[in-house]
């Protein structure tokens, strides 16, 4: 490449590589690479790999190109996931089985462990594995609000499909609310969209984690793929760095 | 400002101004500024000013910061608007008045006049002026599909408000469909959101252009502010330039 | 668009995205990032000729604005346009962490 | 953020958004744009010091990355971050037109 003077491509690459070295460490707020002295031998734990793959894979409803990030979003976000409370838990008994809805509850103590302060949360996604679907279905997501009331959050038009597919709903605001409140268990409801005229309100879509009578080994896989919250948050120690350096300039 | 050498701020400003001169013309695909020789004397027509103000004002549900634009979107879009067919038109008689819905129809010949080819349309917004609202209302937008069926498009949670406010729905895909089809009149329905459990399905929100018994002068203002489609499209002649220059590099 | 599809298959002299694969172990001497082993970072390089709009061949100048100076800058610069995040797995002590680093992979460039 | 709120009220020497109002008639000699009469175009200006991550004062270097070289560029550059569109009214012959020009107003800058 030539402009006025010839560009030394190798020098540019070296400078880029050196800049990336600092960029990664600065995004992780590490003064130096962490020591590997205490890393357990053998491959990465399954759960860690599963989480890494969840983060790496794009899911339906997620944009491929992120928007320009605000300054606070420059820093890396720690990714964790909290699985839905299993369906044999007594909390589900309080909600009558219906043809138009399924319920998903989450333990807020697990959420708080992952994200100690609401302000640290930058993104929360509810991820559901939908199994094959014969007909188009319009679904709605609600948040458990008070004793027996539900607040509408969002909707999705699901196209028929022969293969399972992850669905993702942005529930950042809701999870932030939950982290601010004192409740022990909080939940979502996925319902068929009910038009004012139509009376066909059956939820046709099959969400992984709700069907019963499976073979033992399949049930385990099924349980791992049950609905979960994928959380991206600034780790507490990094947040403290952020606050102290925010007003420096 | 000083780096290694002092920056000549005035030179930078002059270069920026010169660049803007070219940028505006290139975005409009004009070889030179258009002559004003045949511009009618007097102020701008009211309709043009109203359209300009619609474009300039941010409305509820619109993002303040546009996302990075694809290459084709670099060029300016011509902005036009098509008003809803007035409510005394016979088309409305076919749809029974209901407490949960209002109907909005549009003349597709007017749409085609504004946008001759579906591919030229880059954005279409349905804009409604909502009058004051006493209670929170969850509304849904539907598209007239076949004889008497409606297809869900989107929804909005309207907060109580003492003052009128413009609502905007992105209906680009729908309008593109309409431009491709042969229909003469096409329409939307705005309905109360009907939950599967709830039976209170009344549309509480008052949309400008649907109430009756107004004083004459108010009725005119009211008519001008009735629902409309705001269209942004590449003018035909510019599209031809685009196609011919697309594969130059 | 000055993206990987166009730039990697052309000999574009002006602003374009250039290939660069970072192998954490080889290039940075790091063994602490467990996943991935490396990533396609890429980078932007190439001139963005400033366009004087008083140029004599004005019609030609206008056609170049979109590529060379779409933001009408006084000194346009070749910079990333589309960026993608990079999730990584690493350990802090005995504890594995999965983190997503924003804007790490350059997919396309622009003159800005 | 290097936006109008921060930059217009500070004496920042490094990369920042700078004030620039364009009056179509006075600055461009144009009378053909009927609305608006002008607009706050603004522009980005100021150095983005390149950060060598092998600097001796390494902890200080890391703190500067976000501002001076967030994209880990080999030659960071001060460019627009947030941009806004500009609608205009003009005539072509006898016909008035309302058009929206994308990315015309610089609201903030970044080192990229």
């Amino acid at each position: 490449l030539s402009t006025c003077k010839t560009i030394d491509m190798e020098l540019v690459k070296r400078k880029r590589i050196e800049a990336i070295r600092g960029q990664i460490l600065s995004k992780l707020r590490l003064a130096s690479p962490p020591s590997q002295g205490e890393v357990p031998p053998g491959p990465l734990p399954e759960a860690v790999l599963a989480l890494y793959n969840s983060t790496r894979d794009r899911v339906a409803g997620e944009s491929a190109e992120p928007e320009p990030e605000p300054e606070a979003d420059y820093y890396a976000k720690e990714v964790t996931r909290v699985l839905m409370v299993e369906t044999h838990n007594e909390i589900y008994d309080k909600f009558k089985q219906s043809t138009h809805s399924i319920y998903m509850f989450f333990n807020t103590s697990e959420l708080r462990e992952a994200v100690p302060e609401p302000v640290l949360l930058s993104r929360a996604e509810l991820r559901l594995l939908r199994l094959k679907l014969k007909v188009e279905q319009h679904v709605e997501l609600y948040q458990k609000y008070s004793n027996n009331s539900w607040r509408y959050l969002s909707n999705r038009l699901l196209a028929p499909s022969d293969s399972p597919e992850w669905l993702s709903f942005d529930v950042t605001g809701v999870v932030r609310q939950w982290l601010s409140r004192g409740g022990e268990i909080e939940g979502f409801r996925l319902s068929a969209h009910c038009s004012c005229d139509s009376r066909d309100n059956t939820l046709q879509v099959d969400i992984n984690g709700f069907t019963t009578g499976r073979r033992g080994d399949l049930a385990t896989i099924h349980g791992m793929n049950r609905p979960f919250l994928l959380l991206m948050a600034t780790p507490l120690e990094r947040a403290q760095h952020l606050q102290s350096s925010r007003h420096r300039r | 400002l000083s780096t290694c050498k002092t920056i000549d701020m005035e030179l930078v400003k002059r270069k920026r101004i010169e660049a803007i001169r070219g940028q505006i013309l290139s975005k409009l695909r004009l070889a030179s500024p258009p002559s004003q020789g045949e511009v009618p004397p007097g102020p701008l027509p009211e309709a043009v000013l109203a359209l300009y103000n619609s474009t300039r004002d941010r409305v509820a549900g619109e993002s303040a910061e546009p996302e990075p634009e694809p290459e084709a979107d670099y060029y300016a879009k011509e902005v036009t608007r098509v008003l809803m067919v007035e409510t005394h038109n016979e088309i409305y008689d076919k749809f029974k008045q209901s407490t949960h819905s209002i109907y909005m129809f549009f003349n597709t010949s007017e749409l085609r006049e504004a946008v001759p080819e579906p591919v030229l349309l880059s954005r279409a917004e349905l804009r409604l002026l909502r009058l004051k609202l006493k209670v929170e209302q969850h509304v849904e937008l539907y598209q007239k599909y076949s004889n008497n069926s409606w297809r869900y498009l989107s929804n909005r949670l309207l907060a109580p408000s003492d003052s009128p406010e413009w609502l905007s729905f992105d209906v680009t895909g729908v309008v593109r469909q309409w431009l491709s089809r042969g229909g003469e009149i096409e329409g939307f329905r705005l309905s109360a959101h009907c939950s599967c459990d709830s039976r209170d399905n009344t549309l509480q929100v008052d949309i400008n252009g649907f109430t009756t018994g107004r004083r004459g002068d108010l009725a005119t203002i009211h008519g001008m502010n009735r629902p409309f489609l705001l269209l942004m499209a590449t003018p035909l002649e510019r599209a031809q330039h685009l196609q011919s220059s697309r594969h130059r590099r | 668009a000055l993206d990987t599809n166009y730039c990697f298959s052309s000999t574009e002299k002006n602003c374009c995205v250039r290939q660069l694969y970072i192998d954490f172990r080889k290039d940075l001497g790091w063994k602490w990032i467990h996943e991935p082993k490396g990533y396609h970072a890429n980078f932007c390089l190439g001139p963005c000729p400033y366009i004087w709009s008083l140029d004599t061949q004005y019609s030609k100048v206008l056609a170049l604005y979109n590529q060379h100076n779409p933001g009408a800058s006084a000194a346009p610069c070749c910079v990333p346009q589309a960026l993608e995040p990079l999730p990584i797995v690493y350990y802090v002590g005995r504890k594995p962490k999965v983190e997503q680093l924003s804007n790490m992979i350059v997919r396309s460039c622009k003159c800005s | 953020a290097l936006d109008t709120n921060y930059c217009f009220s500070s004496t920042e020497k490094n990369c920042c958004v700078r004030q620039l109002y364009i009056d179509f008639r006075k600055d461009l000699g144009w009378k053909w744009i009927h609305e608006p009469k002008g607009y706050h175009a603004n522009f980005c200006l100021g150095p983005c010091p390149y950060i060598w991550s092998l600097d001796t004062q390494y902890s200080k270097v890391l703190a500067l990355y976000n501002q001076h070289n967030p994209g880990a560029s080999a030659a960071p550059c001060c460019v627009p971050q947030a941009l806004e569109p500009l609608p205009i009214v003009y005539y072509v012959g006898r016909k008035p037109k309302v058009e929206q020009l994308s990315n015309m107003i610089v609201r903030s800058c970044k080192c990229s």
Epitope: - | A31, P33, S35, Q36 | - | G29, G93, R94
Partner: antibody
């Protein structure tokens, strides 16, 4: 190639009328206004009027109002200029010219000489 | 109507010479000034529009400048094919008006 081809030279008597044609090719006829300009022997160029082929809208220079008639036939992409009540000082070369909204004429016909002589 | 005064009315020059023709408008025409070349038996040709913008295909030895009421056409190095009559025209206000022309002849 964009071209404007005009009809041949005409000789007319004072008081008569002349109709000059201008056939356009190589572009969309209705996308540009067509203007007419004349040049008397040894003189400068003089603008006569314009027609918008799309809307049929016409504008004449005051001097030619009532005597000149501009028309178009969009099916053949042809513009016409008719000048009535001819006088000897109407002797000139008549040009059709495609107008760009930048205020200039980017394509001209080759010209039609109209001689008015008794 | 806006009057356009062109000077000189005729001009003799040699191949390789630098030539300047001027045009003055009776009022500010905001750069809407165009230059044309006319040769006997040939169609009139647009050279420069909006004061300084060179029409596609026109050699770069032709250039234009000016603002307000005063405008100039310059031919940096005359070529044999440049001997012709040159007209200016204002495109700011109807009716469009032309200069009287400058006849450029071989010395």
């Amino acid at each position: 190639e964009v071209q404007l081809v005009q009809s041949g030279a005409e000789v007319k008597k004072p008081g008569a009328s002349v109709k000059v044609s201008c056939k356009a090719s190589g572009y969309t006829f209705t996308s540009y206004d067509m203007h007419w300009v004349r040049q008397a022997p040894g003189q400068g160029l003089e603008w006569m009027g314009r027609i918008d082929p799309q809307s049929g809208g016409i504008k004449y220079a005051q001097k030619f109002q009532g005597r000149a008639t501009l028309t178009v036939d969009t099916s053949t992409s042809t513009a016409y200029m008719e000048l009535s009540r001819l006088r000897s000082d109407d002797t000139a070369v008549y040009y059709c010219a495609r107008y760009d909204h930048g205020g200039y004429f980017d394509v001209w016909g080759q010209g039609t000489l109209v001689t008015v002589s008794s | 109507d806006i009057q356009m005064t062109q000077s000189p009315s005729s001009l003799s020059a040699s191949v390789g010479d630098r030539v300047t023709i001027t045009c003055r408008a009776s009022q500010d025409i905001y750069n809407y000034l165009n230059w044309y070349q006319q040769k006997p038996g040939k169609a009139v040709k647009l050279l420069i529009y909006y004061t300084s913008y060179l029409e596609t295909g026109v050699p770069s030895r032709f250039s234009g400048s000016g603002s307000g009421t005063d405008y100039t056409l310059t031919i940096s190095s005359l070529q044999p094919e440049d001997f012709a009559t040159y007209f200016c025209q204002q495109g700011d206000t109807l009716p469009w008006t032309f200069g009287q022309g400058t006849k450029l002849e071989i010395k």
